[in-house]
Interface confidence: medium
């Protein structure tokens, strides 16, 4: 058995349902998406050995499903998946990877073929610990690369300052696949939000630890950089579920500390 969870039940139905639902969110000129063709292009990876799937195996899938990302609406993240999805609000506020069509159809899903058979493996799928070229990691690598290339204007990044290993994972999708593919000529500045869990530890904040590494890397690449601790609109959303916690006592907006380059 592999270390990861098996293929999600009803994978095709979920995929096609999400695709059809998402088409309604696209502008009329971008709405002509063939969900079955997109599924078939995605399914190319399901015909391959589960440790032999490359990011490029998803090229056609990306080419059929990609669409423009509104300027200033990109939201990158690490270790804050659920919070990002909630805050983005189905593209209303922002459009993270999970809110573009090619990310939406696969969000929180798992998939792989059986090792020596053509059927799907519903028991387990490989993770990066099992093999690098597994279907799910290769998918998100390819999707992350495309998302970065298509992002423009102000780039927003939500990081988790309560993460024990630090807010900015030196080895992660943001570091390895997204930052290198940002198109400098299309980007005005990068704004980082370091969020801390309500009642959780404050492991890192702007300008500390791994955040200094990130700041240096982005500045060295020539990006204008700013960092905000506990960006208030996101903090208010976190507080919906913790309304009586002291961290959620209403204070002036000035309480959110800010460091600008």
């Amino acid at each position: 058995r592999w270390r990861g969870e098996g293929t999600s039940a009803h994978l095709r139905d979920i995929f096609l349902g999400r695709c059809a639902e998402y088409r309604a969110l696209l502008s009329p000129e971008q709405r002509n998406k063939n969900c079955t063709a997109i599924w078939e292009a995605f399914k190319v990876a399901l015909d391959k050995d589960p440790c032999s799937v490359l990011p490029s195996d998803y090229d056609l899938f990306i080419n059929l499903s990609r669409h423009s990302i509104p300027r200033d609406k990109s939201l990158f993240w690490e270790n804050s998946h659920l919070l990002v999805n909630s805050f983005a609000d189905n593209t209303r506020r922002f459009m993270p990877l999970s809110d573009v069509l090619y990310g939406r159809v696969a969000d929180f899903l798992s998939w792989c073929r059986q090792k020596n058979d053509s059927g799907l493996d519903y028991q387990s799928c490989p993770t990066s610990e099992d093999c690098e070229n597994n279907p799910v990691d290769s998918f998100w690598k390819r999707a992350s690369i495309q998302y970065s290339k298509d992002s423009s204007g102000v780039i927003h990044v939500m990081l988790n300052g309560s993460e024990p290993t630090g807010a900015y994972p030196i080895k992660g999708f943001f570091a390895d696949y997204e930052i290198p593919n940002l198109q400098k000529e299309k980007i005005t500045r990068i704004e980082i939000w370091v969020m801390h869990e309500i009642g959780g530890p404050n492991v890192e904040s702007c300008g500390e630890g791994s955040m200094k590494v990130l700041e240096k890397r982005l500045k060295d690449m020539g990006f204008q950089y700013s960092c905000i601790n506990d960006y208030r609109p996101v903090k208010l959303l976190q507080c919906v579920d913790h309304s009586t916690h002291p961290d959620c006592a209403l204070k002036s907006a000035a309480a959110a500390t800010q460091r600008k380059a």
Epitope: N34, C35, I38, S56
Partner: antibody
Framework: QAYLQQSGPELVKAGASVKMSCKAS????????INWVKQSHGKSLEWIGN????????YYNQMFTGKATLTVDQSSNTAYMQLKSLTSEDSAVYFC?????????WGQGTLVTVSA | DIQMTQSPSSLSASVGDRVTITCSAS?????MYWYQQKPGKAPKLLIY???NLASGVPSRFSGSGSGTDYTLTISSLQPEDFATYYC?????????FGQGTKVEIK
Amino acid sequence: QAYLQQSGPELVKAGASVKMSCKASGYSFIEYTINWVKQSHGKSLEWIGNIDPYYGTTYYNQMFTGKATLTVDQSSNTAYMQLKSLTSEDSAVYFCARGSAWFPYWGQGTLVTVSA
Amino acid sequence: DIQMTQSPSSLSASVGDRVTITCSASSSVTYMYWYQQKPGKAPKLLIYDTSNLASGVPSRFSGSGSGTDYTLTISSLQPEDFATYYCQQWSNYPLTFGQGTKVEIK
């Protein structure tokens, strides 16, 4: 085994329209894209476009936009292609084929001859 | 659109010969597909994902390549292999085919 059965040859007058069919059997019709490919006499293959039988959405090669119209009838597992304003340039064999990007299954082809 | 250029456009060969057909794409593509077509028939898939043999295709057929340059090889030409061969790119719509290579009996 998947099988695509196309309608018979058509002899049509210039300026008229023609509608040909492609009946699928041996697999779940709604699960696979149906493509249409043109082959003029002695020439190569040209991809016209495809249709998603599940939702009915279409994707056309720009060269054929306005010339071809793709439809499906789920109840009869049949895909259709209508060609309008026919000219001698439209005289060709038209194939239907299954797949989103490459085609392991093809119909036998429908010959369309446009006469003056 | 990605343009596909096959060479040669035709060739004459004898039974038992090794035959190589090349296909060049105008920009990089992920995979190449190869079809065989005989007169009056629909094309038949030979090779998918650049190098994999389609079901029922003899092992004398093989495919290779990457980026913009791809090759179909028939290791030992048989009488039933005299036909026209087409390459097709996978990477983006519109899907495009090469102009074909006709393999004739010498």
